[in-house]
């Protein structure tokens, strides 16, 4: 059986302080312990929670913790449940409140000789003791002009007189602590000869050229005087009006009327009431000229169907604050529904494609009206008008792949070739409607293409394979002029490609057949040993069934390739002497010789007096200078081949002969003696 070792007991507690209701049980089986408050299970919160089997209070609350607490233990195995005795808190607390007028019903009814009762709304447990104050000074209980009822928390003034006027406050204390009134009461018992406000002027906002009215009334015995004054202290009367208030009228009841208001009339107006005795009462009211600023324009907005979207109206500043509303197709939007207005916001709870259009935000006040349109586009996922198709494109011609889609807004189309983005260049162009143009189709354009059409709402894609229909062409085209070396083996290749593999063959241009030492092996012309007779015009013919035939004409020249009879040697020359660089070449056709010195070709027509190239090809340089030093290249060329050979030229100072060097001494360099 379940036994309580410790049961919760009733106890004193302080509002907002810690407390603990103890409960300890003993049972043979595991026991589930929970708490009831007034018979209802207690849920754990940060403030009040189970701590083991006890109930802990971080901060006692007089409202939430009043009542009977019970500790309940339940044996999970046997189903037995027992409850502790009830325990409750005696919660001590004190709470501040205002001083309020209990009698008469309103301040307006307070007159001299009236009985006035004030109540102190400080409450607590145990019942607090109260102390009243006027202007911070404690009121004693023994004065004949007032009575204090602690039980009722009341202060009664009988009868009220002007001497009772002042700020009334109260404080109270009990076992918990002390509190003072949260809001005090100002008692004003008027002297009848003092001016009192009956009607105070209010701030006014008017549009230019409209009229403005200020009301003002005082009362006193005898009746008080009333005067209106504008900002600069200029009095306003029907007899003497300041120049800028020519259209002002003061009525007998104290109201001030301003007609056809201008900006200079805006400002503070003071209504001054003066009784027979007492200070003047000055009441202020401001005349504002209505104004409204311009509205900022909207950026066009693109939204995705199905989303919740909001557009905030850039409401203009204005006086009075402009009222703002949204319209669509000239109809104001409702406060509720799928599309509605909430404050300054245009709200689409779930935006739909049909919501595309122009929405207008209006702002209006006395000064006028402003409006701004916002263009709202609800993006849709593109749909196909024409997908790219697998295509056969002809080599060398323009090729087109279509990717026609429609959506809102206009979709953007990008193309991929072999998974690589196609950037527009001289060969590829993407038109506005998404069509890809390949300006001149090449063989390697035969691959997989993919187009992606997108809007903010999503994208679609499709792919197509391009097969290139090859031109019948020579690959590469044979050189129209070619040379063969006399008495040597030579080959002249000719190959072609097309939609079908073409047959390639050689013929002589004059129609005569190839000699037996010349063979045509699948387009390669082979000369076992070139003779002079092999020179001439030859035609390579490539043909296949679907494309016909193509021809390439080649002129073959038989030549003796160039060799050097004499090559220039490494030469050292004294400055001022003449250098001779010899070079002779032979070949058929007879080679021409050119020289290159210091990395530029020496033009025979522009050599000047110091340099000369002989008929046999040798180069002579007179009066050599150090800057002539360098590498010289002899280039021999004819229509069939070109060869070159080079040698360095070094120009040195002539040495001064020393005594030790007799005529028999060898020169320091191998010289050309000139």
């Amino acid at each position: 059986a379940i036994v309580f070792i410790k049961e919760p007991s009733s106890q004193d507690a302080l509002q907002g302080r810690r407390a603990l209701l103890r409960c300890e049980v003993e049972a043979p089986d595991p026991v589930h312990v929970y708490w009831l408050l007034n018979g209802v299970p207690v849920q754990d919160t940060e403030r009040r929670f189970a701590q083991g089997s006890s109930l802990s209070f971080a901060a006692v609350d007089r409202l939430q913790d009043s009542g009977a607490f019970q500790c309940v233990a339940r044996d999970n195995v046997t189903g037995e449940e027992v409850r502790s005795t009830n325990a409750s808190f005696n919660i001590k607390w004190i709470e501040a409140g205002p001083v309020v007028l209990k009698h008469p019903a309103s301040e307006a009814e307070i007159q001299p000789q009236t009985q006035v009762t004030l109540r102190c709304h400080i409450d607590g447990h145990p019942r607090p003791t109260y102390q009243w104050f006027r202007d911070g000074t404690p009121l004693s209980d023994d004065q004949s002009t007032h009575t204090v009822s602690s039980r009722e928390r009341n202060l009664t003034l009988r009868p009220a007189s002007p001497e009772h006027s002042g700020l009334y406050s109260c404080c109270a204390h009990n076992a918990f602590g002390q509190a003072c009134s949260s809001q005090n009461f100002t008692l004003s018992v008027a002297d009848e000869s003092f001016a009192r406000v009956v009607l105070a002027p209010q701030d006014v906002v008017v549009a230019r050229n409209e009229e403005a009215m200020f009301h003002c009334q005082f009362s006193a015995q005898p009746p008080p005087s009333l005067q209106w004054v504008f900002e600069d202290e200029t009095p306003i009367t029907n007899r003497s009006r300041p120049p800028h208030l020519r259209r002002a009228v003061v009525f007998a009841n104290g109201s001030l009327l301003l007609t056809q208001v201008r900006p200079r009339n805006a400002g503070v107006y003071r209504c001054i009431g003066q009784g027979q005795r007492g200070p003047p009462i000055v009441l202020e009211a401001t005349l504002h000229l209505a104004e409204i600023e311009d509205m900022l324009p909207f950026e066009p907005r693109v939204f995705i169907a199905g989303d919740e979207e909001r557009v905030t109206c850039p409401a203009p500043q204005g006086l009075p604050t402009p009222s703002v509303w949204w319209e669509h197709a000239g109809v104001p939007l409702p406060a509720h529904g799928r599309v509605h207005q909430k404050g300054l916001e245009l709200v689409f709870v779930t935006i739909a494609e049909s919501d595309t259009g122009v929405y207008t935000c209006h702002a209006s006040n006395l000064a006028g009206q402003r409006r701004q349109d916002v263009n709202i586009t609800v993006a849709t996922v593109p749909t196909w008008l024409r997908k790219p198709q697998d295509s056969q494109l002809e080599e060398g011609k323009p090729g087109y792949l279509h990717c026609l889609t429609q959506a809102t807004p206009k979709p953007t189309v990008i193309w991929y070739r072999n998974q690589m983005l196609i950037s527009e260049d001289s060969r590829f162009e993407v038109s506005k409607n998404g069509t890809l143009r390949i300006n001149s189709v090449e063989v390697y354009d035969g691959t997989l293409y993919r187009c992606v059409s997108s809007t903010p709402a999503g994208s679609i894609e499709a792919q197509a394979r391009v097969q290139v229909l090859e031109k019948l062409k020579f690959t590469p085209p044979p050189q129209p002029q070619q040379c063969m070396e006399f008495d040597k083996e030579a080959t002249v290749p000719c190959s072609a490609t097309g939609r079908e593999k073409p047959t390639v063959k050689w013929v002589r241009a004059d129609g005569s057949s190839l000699p037996e030492w010349v063979t045509d092996n699948a387009g390669t012309l082979h000369f076992a040993r070139v003779t002079r007779d092999d020179a001439g015009n030859y035609t390579c013919i490539a043909s296949n069934e679907p494309q016909g035939q193509i021809r390439a004409h080649v002129q073959l020249t038989v030549a003796v390739f160039i060799t050097f009879k004499v090559e220039p040697e490494r030469t050292t020359v004294y400055q001022g002497h003449t250098a001779l660089l010899r070079c002779e070449a032979q070949g058929d056709p007879k080679p021409l010789i050119q020289w290159k010195g210091k990395d530029r070709i020496l033009d025979p027509t522009k050599l000047g007096p110091r340099m000369h190239i002989f008929q046999n090809g040798s180069l002579v340089i007179h009066d050599v200078a150090p800057e002539d030093s360098g590498s010289y290249t002899c280039i021999a060329g004819n229509s069939c081949n070109i060869r070159h050979t080079e040698a360095p030229l070094l120009v040195v100072d002539k040495p001064v002969m020393e005594d030790s060097e007799g005529p028999g001494s060898p020169p320091p360099y191998k010289m050309i003696q000139t």
Epitope: P30, H32, S53, R74, N76, V77, T78, G79, E80, E81
Partner: antibody
Amino acid sequence: QVQMQQSGAELMKPGASVKLSCKATGYTFTGYWIEWVKQRPGHGLEWIGEILPGSGRSNSNEKFKGKATFTADTSSNTAYMQLSSLTTEDSAIYYCARGKLSWGQGTLVTVSA
Amino acid sequence: DIVLTQSPASLAVSLGQRATISCRASESVDSFGNSFMHWYQQKPGQPPKLLIYAASNLGSGVPARFSGSGSGTDFSLNIHPVEEDDSAMYFCQQSKEVPRTFGGGSRLEIK
């Protein structure tokens, strides 16, 4: 010793109500929770709810709210479970148990048109 | 609701060997220092019988061959050595929260 004696088998029409009883002996009836469990072939065991006879307090499975109502008569030490708006889905063996240890023999309810 | 997942759904164990059944809870069933997880055995035509209560406590009159372990969300029932009479359905149940929920059951067969 603790015993839980349940009422006999019931054959009911769809839409009808049935009240099952569970008589407890051998312990203080008011201080122990009585639990009700449903068993359908191939559906395992389902906890329907429980009642503490002394206070009349009960807890039930949300799934059976509106289907099962628990009461107890302390004078006869008997707990009751009423099943309303019967359907073929309610065909099952219903057990009562005091805690986890002492189970009744079960009552077979068959709902058939 | 706390969901209890039992595994395996069925097992066949040779006489004298060990049988282990697992039960996993969708959230912790620990409270007041106890694990409120219990194990039952049920044979055809009979009501369930309490084997283990509060995860590891042996029920009244239950042989010591049965043992339970685990805390929080993972629990297991062990039978060793298995006897012919142990052929039955086994269920786990949590009583931490209303509704008290049962596992789907595990059928033990003796080979």
